[in-house]
């Protein structure tokens, strides 16, 4: 057992098996589920951590309000289906043949379908709204203290770009984080915001998907910041395609 | 543990060259990293380009450097730097430094090699 | 993305103090190191976080600020002290822009 084997680990993605085993006996670590090879120095992709996670062991407001066409993510866990760079293929089925089509973000942006069903292109999500709602506290947080925090914690633990959080809303107890990120805007090596927002959203359920890291410990100037509950929208770059029946459902 | 780079030396104008930077006492195959930096005659630091060396091989590079430089790291105890296009302006020192948290955005280097000097002229 | 690092020269007796500032152009939390660098020789990590000492360092190296401001203090001047001092972030690494500070080279009288 040796000293590379030691340092041979994933700090972005336990849920990762790793092995001196790359070109010219460099670290590479491997995603459950997939096998596929993954970048530690960033966050994994929300597909890959989707797969991996069914692979493993079962255990005057200020406030915005989410757009006609704000999707949230209903179906909850799915297996599945990537693409070679581990990004969500755009058509995902069951094995029962139920076919769909998902945004980047893996959330279902049309009704179900078979194996006819045709998904022409992943469509961005563009625009996320994490709503959080915190415990109560001996008084508001201060907001600029609490904006700076929360783009403090997205840059340094999700490694996203600060340009990318477009805002932070509050109206104690509702917080709200905005994440925008454009096509054109998204760099090579640029975090997605839809995979910082999975593993703010893991963060928060107190299911880190960081290496042997603890939980997190979110404070505004010392202030423990607990969250009781937690919504995402995702608003993608073309409408969802969903029926009448639905929407009035 | 320490750093040591190579590959220094004279270059004509417009030519290219490889430096190496080799650790010894600790393997490279970890969860950080590595970067170049460089230093002119009687100037300040700046900083080249980065590669993690863990899983993955992320890069970065200082606007000035993309194109001309590549930084890659083929094993488990080297990482290279490769310029083209070489100027006088390129005359420098080149340091090779480790960083030491495996979060690119939150760095330090706290093991640096002792530099090899690079002189562009005809 | 800027770094700017005042003065770019001061001089001092021995058992002086020596105050350096560090200006960046956005929030970089506390993520801020400061180097010392003697000619002939790579620099050499002094603090990190903005405040924390590395091993080996002296007290007499004190770091301080958040944000955008940070200050290097040396207490206590000794003529080992005579070097250059360098700021350093890379919060902004992924904009292609040099983290260093333009340097301030420490006299000691």
């Known amino acids: 057992h040796t000293a590379a084997q030691d340092n041979c680990t994933c700090p972005t993605n336990k849920m990762t098996v790793c092995s001196p085993d790359g070109p010219g006996g460099r670290c590479q670590c491997r995603a459950l589920g997939s096998g596929m090879a993954v970048d530690c120095s960033t966050l994994t992709s929300k597909c890959l951590l989707l797969k991996a996670r069914m692979s493993a062991p079962k255990n005057a407001r200020t406030l915005v309000r989410p757009s006609e066409h704000a999707l949230v993510d209903n179906d909850g866990l799915y297996d599945p289906d990537c693409d070679p760079e581990g990004r969500f293929k755009a058509r995902q089925c069951n094995q029962t043949s139920v076919c769909w089509c998902v945004n980047s973000v893996g959330v279902r942006r049309t009704d179900k379908g078979d194996l006819s069903l045709r998904c022409d292109e992943l469509v961005r999500t563009h625009h996320i709204l994490i709503d959080l709602r915190h415990r109560p506290t001996a008084g508001a947080f201060n907001h600029s203290d609490l904006d700076a925090e929360l783009r403090r914690l997205f840059r340094e633990r999700y490694r996203l770009h600060p340009k990318f959080v477009a805002a932070v809303h509050y109206e104690q107890p509702t917080i709200q984080i905005e994440l925008r990120q454009n096509t054109s805007q998204k760099a090579a090596g640029d975090v997605d915001i839809g995979d910082a927002a999975y593993y703010f959203e893991r963060d928060i359920k107190g299911e880190s998907l960081f290496q042997g890291r603890g939980g997190l410990d979110l404070r505004v100037r010392g202030e423990p910041l607990q969250v009781e509950r937690t919504l995402i929208y995702y608003l993608d770059e073309i409408p969802p395609k969903f029926s009448m029946k639905r929407l009035t459902a | 543990q320490q750093l040591e780079e190579s590959g220094g030396g004279l270059v004509k104008p417009e030519g290219s060259l490889t430096l190496t930077c080799k650790g010894s006492?600790?393997?490279?195959?970890?969860?950080?990293w590595m970067w170049w930096v460089r230093q002119a005659p009687g100037k300040g630091l700046e900083w080249i380009a980065?590669?993690?060396?863990?899983?993955?091989?992320?890069t970065y590079y200082a606007s000035w450097a993309k194109g001309r430089f590549t930084i890659s790291s083929t094993s488990s105890t080297a990482v290279t730097l490769q310029a083209t296009s070489l100027t006088a302006a390129d005359t420098a020192t080149y340091f090779c430094?480790?960083?030491?948290?495996?979060?690119?955005?939150?760095?330090?280097?706290?093991?640096w090699g002792p530099g090899t000097l690079v002189t562009v002229s005809s | 993305f800027e770094m700017t690092q005042t003065p770019s020269s001061v001089s001092e007796p021995v058992g002086g103090t020596v105050t350096i500032k560090c200006q960046a152009s956005?929030?970089?939390?506390?993520?801020l190191g400061w180097y010392q660098q003697k000619p002939g020789q790579p620099p050499k990590l002094l603090i990190y976080g903005a405040s924390t000492l590395a091993s080996g360092v002296p007290s007499r190296f004190k770091g301080s600020g958040s944000g955008t401001e940070f200050t290097l203090t040396i207490s206590d001047l000794e003529a080992a002290d005579a070097a250059t001092y360098y700021c350093q972030t890379s919060y902004y690494i992924d904009d292609g822009v040099n983290g260093f500070g333009g340097g301030t080279e420490v006299v000691v009288k």
């Open positions: 980065s590669i993690y060396v863990g899983s993955g091989s992320s």
């Open positions: 956005e929030d970089i939390s506390s993520n």
């Open positions: 430094a480790r960083g030491a948290t495996n979060n690119v955005f939150m760095n330090y280097f706290n093991l």
């Open positions: 006492g600790f393997d490279f195959s970890g969860t950080y």
